[in-house]
Interface confidence: low
Amino acid sequence: ILGGREAEAHARPYMASVQVNGEHLCGGVLVAEQWVLSAAHCLEDAADGKVQVLLGAHSLSQPEPSKRLYDVLRAVPHPDSRPDTIDHDLLLLQLSEKATLGPAVRPLPWQRVDRDVEPGTLCDVAGWGIVSHAGRRPDRLQHVLLPVLDRATCNRRTHHDGAITQRMMCAESNRRDSCKGDSGGPLVCGGVLEGVVTSGSRVCGNRKKPGIYTRVASYAAWIDSVLA
C-alpha cells in the first residue's frame, strides 16, 4: 500500500495473507468459513511452493493470539484466467478446515448486485504489499482509502486505454495506491467486498495508471458454484 497508514489491529477480520513457503505473497479475503478469495495470478508466482493462508494477523512476524496458518486443500483459479491478461483474475482457496471465527477472523459479505460502485465513493484497500517504490515491505497491515474512478476515465488512452472491462473497476492512484504484494486483497466499500486487487505488474502511485480491481459481483455465479 503506497501513501497509506498502519491499519487498526484486527479491525479487518476478513483479511488474509496468502503465503508460499512461509513468505507473504498476496492478499486475500475470507468470504466463507473455509474459503479465501484472492487473485489467480498469485498462483503463478507460487511455482511448486507450499501455499498456505494466514488469518487473524496484523503483524506478519510477531506472535498474536488470533493468528493461525491454514493449509490449502484446494486452489480454484477462475477457469478463464490467463497468464497474459488480468481478465478474470480471481482465485478461490479452500482451507484445510473451517476457520475458527472470532473478533479477528470473520468472513466479509461480498457484493452480489452487478452494478458499478458510484464514482467518488471512498473504498478501503488493505494489504502487506510494498509501501515504497524502493520495495520496502511492511510487517504490519497497511490500508488506504481510495475514491472509485469512473470506467470511462480509466479507459482513456492516457490511462488504461480500453483495457478495463465491465468486470473490472478502477480506483484513483495519485500517490495513494495498492501495489506489489497487495494483489488478491480486498477493496471494501461500505462494509461490503466490491473488488479484488488485480495482480498485473502495473506501476503504482501514478495518477495516470489507476488501480484495477476485479468486481466480485460480476463473478457471483462462479463464486457460488465453487462454494456450493
Epitope: E8, Y14, A32, L101, G102, P103, P109, Q111, R112, G190
Partner: antibody, heavy 122, light 107 residues
Framework: EVQLQQSGPELVKPGASVKISCKAS????????MNWVKQSPEKSLEWIGD????????TYNQNFKAKATLTVDKSSSTAYMHLKSLTSEDSAVYYC???????????????WGQGTLVTVSA | DIVMTQSHKFMSTSVGDRVSITCKAS??????VAWYQQKPGQSPKLLIF???TRHTGVPDRFTGSGSGTDYTLTISSVQAEDLALYYC?????????FGGGTKLEIK
C-alpha cells in the same frame, strides 16, 4: 429505513416443524449477516446462528445445530429459520437481527425484527 | 462457550439517579462487549458496543466501561423511559452469548 418484518405467531404441536420468515428492506440484503436469536423466560437471549446472505454460508451455535436450519431467498430479501422436532422447551419468541459492523468488525446486532412467538402445545 | 453473568436480576432506582448495571464474562473478552435495552413488548435495541462506543442515536446519559472480564453500563440520570431490561453480550467469539438480563425498575 432498515426494517425486518417477521412472520406471525405460530401454535404448533410437539414433534412438528415450523418455518419463520424475516423480510428485510431498507438496506442491501447481502451486505450483512442475518442472525436468529431465541428469547425465553428460562434462558434469556440465546444466539441460534447466522447466515451470510451472499453465500448462504451458516454458522450455528452447537446447541441449536440439530434444531434450526437457516436459509435465505435473495430474490425476495427474505431469511428463513426452520425449526424441527419441536418440544415445549422450544416455546419462545424468535428474533431475526442483522449484524452491525464498525470498522468492519462485527460488534453486535443493530436491527431486530419484531419477533415471532412460537408456542408448542398439544 | 463464554458465559456472561449479570448478577443483579432487578435494580430499583429513582428518576434522576445514577445507576450502574454490571456484567462479568467467564474469560477476558478484550472489551468486545455490547449492551442492549429491551422495553416491555419491544425488541432489544443496541446501545453500546466495544464496551464504551455508543450506537447511533443513543443518548449520552448511557455510558459503557470496563475491560478484561468486568463491564458496566451506567445511566447518569435515569429517566422514566429507561424502565427496561438491559442485556450485555460478548462479541469476542462465537457463539455470541448474552447475560441473563437486569430489569431496571423505577421506584
Amino acid at each position: 429505513e432498515v426494517q425486518l418484518q417477521q412472520s406471525g405467531p405460530e401454535l404448533v404441536k410437539p414433534g412438528a416443524s415450523v418455518k419463520i420468515s424475516c423480510k428485510a428492506s431498507g438496506y442491501s440484503f447481502t451486505a450483512y449477516y442475518m442472525n436468529w436469536v431465541k428469547q425465553s423466560p428460562e434462558k434469556s437471549l440465546e444466539w441460534i446462528g447466522d447466515i451470510n446472505p451472499s453465500t448462504g454460508g451458516t454458522t450455528y451455535n452447537q446447541n441449536f445445530k440439530a434444531k434450526a436450519t437457516l436459509t435465505v431467498d435473495k430474490s425476495s430479501s427474505t431469511a428463513y429459520m426452520h425449526l424441527k422436532s419441536l418440544t415445549s422447551e422450544d416455546s419462545a419468541v424468535y428474533y431475526c437481527a442483522t449484524t452491525y459492523y464498525s470498522g468492519n468488525s462485527y460488534v453486535g446486532f443493530a436491527y431486530w425484527g419484531q419477533g415471532t412467538l412460537v408456542t408448542v402445545s398439544a | 462457550d463464554i458465559v456472561m453473568t449479570q448478577s443483579h436480576k432487578f435494580m430499583s432506582t429513582s428518576v434522576g439517579d445514577r445507576v450502574s448495571i454490571t456484567c462479568k464474562a467467564s474469560q477476558d473478552v478484550s472489551t468486545a462487549v455490547a449492551w442492549y435495552q429491551q422495553k416491555p413488548g419491544q425488541s432489544p435495541k443496541l446501545l453500546i458496543f466495544w464496551a464504551s462506543t455508543r450506537h447511533t442515536g443513543v443518548p449520552d446519559r448511557f455510558t459503557g466501561s470496563g475491560s478484561g472480564t468486568d463491564y458496566t453500563l451506567t445511566i447518569s440520570s435515569v429517566q422514566a423511559e429507561d424502565l427496561a431490561l438491559y442485556y450485555c453480550q460478548q462479541h469476542y467469539s462465537t457463539p455470541w452469548t448474552f447475560g441473563g438480563g437486569t430489569k431496571l425498575e423505577i421506584k
